[in-house]
């Protein structure tokens, strides 16, 4: 007998994970056999849709690989022409492990601004989002909050906020971690220690000290009266994001020195400045120990002999050291006009380097004497005859003043580079001239009173200003 369709197993709510299989069963009793159709959210599911499988005369609907978009109300309708059609409906709840759809990215932010690290998630049940900084869970506070979207918002970013972050999305089905990202906090350049102004005597050495910090670590440049510093030595060290710059100056004129700290934030720069004035005091009597001061040679007579920018020792036992020492050399050079072409350049080198000795700047400036070996080379090789004549004249009192005695060093009272090669200054001119010694005739028949050592090669005999001693 014909029988109207009856759904004996109504549809139930089905939970399914993404990419898994989900099946709805719609068991129908009727005669004749009914036609069964399926809808999702009231839209007919086509029999030839390859995402579905419909079996058992339409009573089983299988979704072969569930997608999150398959969520919805599924209904089966049975009709065999006897009586009315019958329908049963059930929901498909697509369950989904957490998935981070918009992960955080590396961020560079300037201190004091607001930073937002995104972390958008998917999942069913809806995942909860938390954040890890370094190896520890991040605690929220008045500045730091996790937004509804999962993003991390940090107000008024501080240096200590810098570090490695990752977000964690969690639901009952599992946990997802983002990749680790870096929050870099950049800090405008700031000067921690400004250079101090000084009132100094002419020829002093002054060290200006400037310390700055910032992220990235700033660079420090020095400006002298509005221009880049042209002379002086700069020493820099960096420790714990602090740059320390020391500008050592040899003071020959007053000036305004500015320390400029600069760092870069993307395409923009931040700078901080601090200035100090150097003024020159009236010349005062030097300390007991201080026999003179250091200055760059500014005379004329020894220009060709002394190294360029040579620091020389000016002896304050003279009222005007520069003028007095220049006069000494000038007077002595006049005597040299009559000496042989072999002797003259050697003697000039010796005189200039003896009267304008190389200078060791420091707390107490000290002159560096000529090496004994070079003095003897002039005395007993280059100028043997002339030296004998000069000594004879001296003994016979033929010189009008003692000036010439001061001009000529007593070789035996000079340090030897054999005992300490750093104790004395070398004469590069003699290193050059000794190459030509082979061609010179012997200059004295008598054996030199001291064996003349081999002078060092010119490569190792650049002028040596001995460096700083500091009592601090």
């Amino acid at each position: 007998l014909p029988k109207a369709p009856v759904i004996t197993t109504p549809l139930e709510t089905v939970d399914a994970l993404v990419e898994e299989v989900a099946t709805f069963m719609c068991a129908v009793e009727s005669y004749p056999q009914p036609e069964i159709s399926w809808t999702r959210n009231k839209i007919l599911i086509k029999l030839f849709d390859t995402r579905y499988s419909i079996r058992e005369n339409g009573q089983l609907l299988t979704i072969l690989s569930v997608e999150d978009s398959d969520d919805g109300i599924y209904c089966c309708t049975a009709n065999n022409g006897v009586g009315g059609a019958v329908e049963s409906c059930g929901a498909l709840q697509v369950k989904m492990k957490p998935k981070i759809t918009r992960p955080p990215i590396n961020v560079k932010i300037i201190e004091g601004l607001k930073a937002v690290l995104p972390c958008t998630t998917m999942g069913n049940p809806k995942p909860s989002v938390s954040w890890i900084k370094g190896d520890s869970p991040l605690r929220e506070n008045s500045r730091i909050a996790v937004l509804e979207s999962g993003s991390l918002r940090i107000h008024n970013v501080q240096k200590e906020d810098a570090g490695q972050y990752r977000c964690v999305a969690k639901n009952s089905l599992g946990t997802a971690y983002s990749k680790v990202v870096k929050l870099e906090v950049e800090v405008f350049a700031r000067i921690l220690r400004a250079p101090e102004s000084h009132n100094v005597t002419f020829g002093s050495f002054v060290t200006l000290h400037c310390t700055a910090t910032g992220i990235p670590v700033p660079t420090i440049t020095w400006i002298e009266n509005g221009n880049a510093v042209s002379s002086g030595s700069i020493q820099e060290s960096v420790k714990d994001r602090v740059i320390d710059s020391r500008l050592q100056l040899f003071i020959t004129k007053p000036g305004l020195y500015t320390c400029i700290a600069t760092n870069k934030h993307g395409e923009k720069f931040s700078t901080a400045k601090a200035a100090a004035t150097i003024s020159i005091a009236e010349w005062s009597k030097p300390q007991k120990d201080n026999k003179g001061y250091c200055a760059q040679y500014r005379g004329e007579v020894c220009n060709a002999v002394l190294a360029k920018d040579a620091l020389v020792f000016l002896n304050t036992s003279y009222a005007d050291p520069e003028e007095a020492q220049e006069l000494l050399v000038h007077t002595a050079w006049n005597e040299l006009k009559v000496v042989s072409p072999v002797c003259r350049p050697a003697a000039e080198a010796l005189l200039c380097n003896h009267i304008f000795q190389e200078c060791s700047p420091g707390v107490v400036p000290t002159p560096i004497p000529i090496c004994r070996e070079y003095c003897l080379a002039v005395k007993e090789l280059f100028c043997a005859k002339e030296w004998l004549v000069m000594e004879e004249k001296t003994h016979r009192g033929l010189y009008r003043s003692e000036m010439h005695l001061l001009s000529v060093p007593e070789c035996s009272k000079l340090p030897s580079m054999h005992w300490d090669p750093t104790a004395c200054a070398r004469l590069p001119h003699l290193d050059y001239n000794k190459e030509n010694l082979k061609t010179f005739p012997p200059m004295t028949s008598s054996k030199p009173s001291v064996d003349i050592p081999n002078l060092p090669s010119s490569s190792s005999s650049s002028f040596s200003v001995s460096p700083t001693y500091s009592m601090t």
Epitope: Q235, A307, S416, D420, P421, Y469
Partner: antibody, heavy 115, light 113 residues
Framework: EVQLVESGGGLVQPGGSLSLSCVAS????????MNWVRQAPGKGLEWLSV???????YYADSVKGRFTISRDNVKNTLYLQLNNLKPEDTALYYC?????????WGQGTQVTVSS | EIVLTQSPNSVTASVGEKVTINCKSS????????????LNWYQQRPGQSPRLLIY???TQQSGIPDRFSGSGSATDFTLTINSVQPEDAAVYYC?????????FGQGTKVELK
């Protein structure tokens, strides 16, 4: 040939004093800078002090105020006066010739500070 | 004060090998007016006083074998022993003579296989 011979070392109690001497020969002593350098047992070298040809002295921070360097150019002798000694001052003390490089070294004299 | 850091702390080499020791200074030890670096190298054999090998960073002290050489400027310096010999087993120190207080590196021990 340069010779530097140190003497004056020995065993002293903490807080005590010692005077080290270094007799120089073979060179014109008065023309050169002289230094003291020490080496604790099994440790590295530590520069202590230098004295220039005008008897101006400079010191390492670790000994400033406790040690005094001096020289007698007539006797060709360098001195180091050690006061308020501490156990960490235990070391071999070398007398060294040199201005900016330490060129010639003595054999050293041992100072032991212990109670 | 200027801090000198040597690397490595120790090295083991076979006779004839090349040994390189580095010394890094916390500040420049080079003077602007003459471009000289005031950096020295010393050798100390077991039970002996140290001896100067190299001064002004690259100038060999008299009597030192040619296999010892120094290089570098400003803050980075190197001592090279070309073709190391058994008698080179020692501790090597760098030292700055640029600014008092003068300072040494911590030393590098060279041992031979």
């Amino acid at each position: 040939e340069v010779q530097l011979v140190e003497s004056g070392g020995g065993l002293v109690q903490p807080g005590g004093s010692l005077s080290l001497s270094c007799v120089a020969s073979g060179f014109t002593f008065s023309l050169y800078y002289m230094n003291w350098v020490r080496q604790a047992p099994g440790k590295g070298l530590e520069w202590l002090s230098v004295i220039d040809t005008h008897s101006i002295a400079y010191y390492a921070d670790s000994v400033k105020g406790r040690f005094t360097i001096s020289r007698d150019n007539v006797k060709n002798t360098l001195y180091l006066q050690l006061n308020n000694l501490k156990p960490e001052d235990t070391a071999l003390y070398y007398c060294v010739l040199g201005r900016t490089a330490l060129v010639r070294w003595g054999q050293g004299t041992q100072v032991t500070v212990s109670s | 004060e200027i801090v000198l850091t040597q690397s490595p702390n120790s090295v083991t080499a076979s006779v004839g090998e090349k040994v390189t020791i580095n010394c890094k200074s916390s500040q420049r030890v080079q003077l602007g007016s003459n471009q000289k670096s005031y950096l020295n190298w010393y050798q100390q054999r077991p039970g002996q006083s140290p001896r100067l090998l190299i001064y002004y960073a690259s100038t060999q002290q008299s009597g030192i074998p040619d296999r010892f050489s120094g290089s570098g400027s400003a803050t980075d310096f190197t001592l090279t022993i070309n073709s190391v010999q058994p008698e080179d087993a020692a501790v090597y120190y760098c030292q700055q003579g640029y600014s008092a207080p003068f300072t040494f590196g911590q030393g590098t021990k060279v041992e031979l296989k």
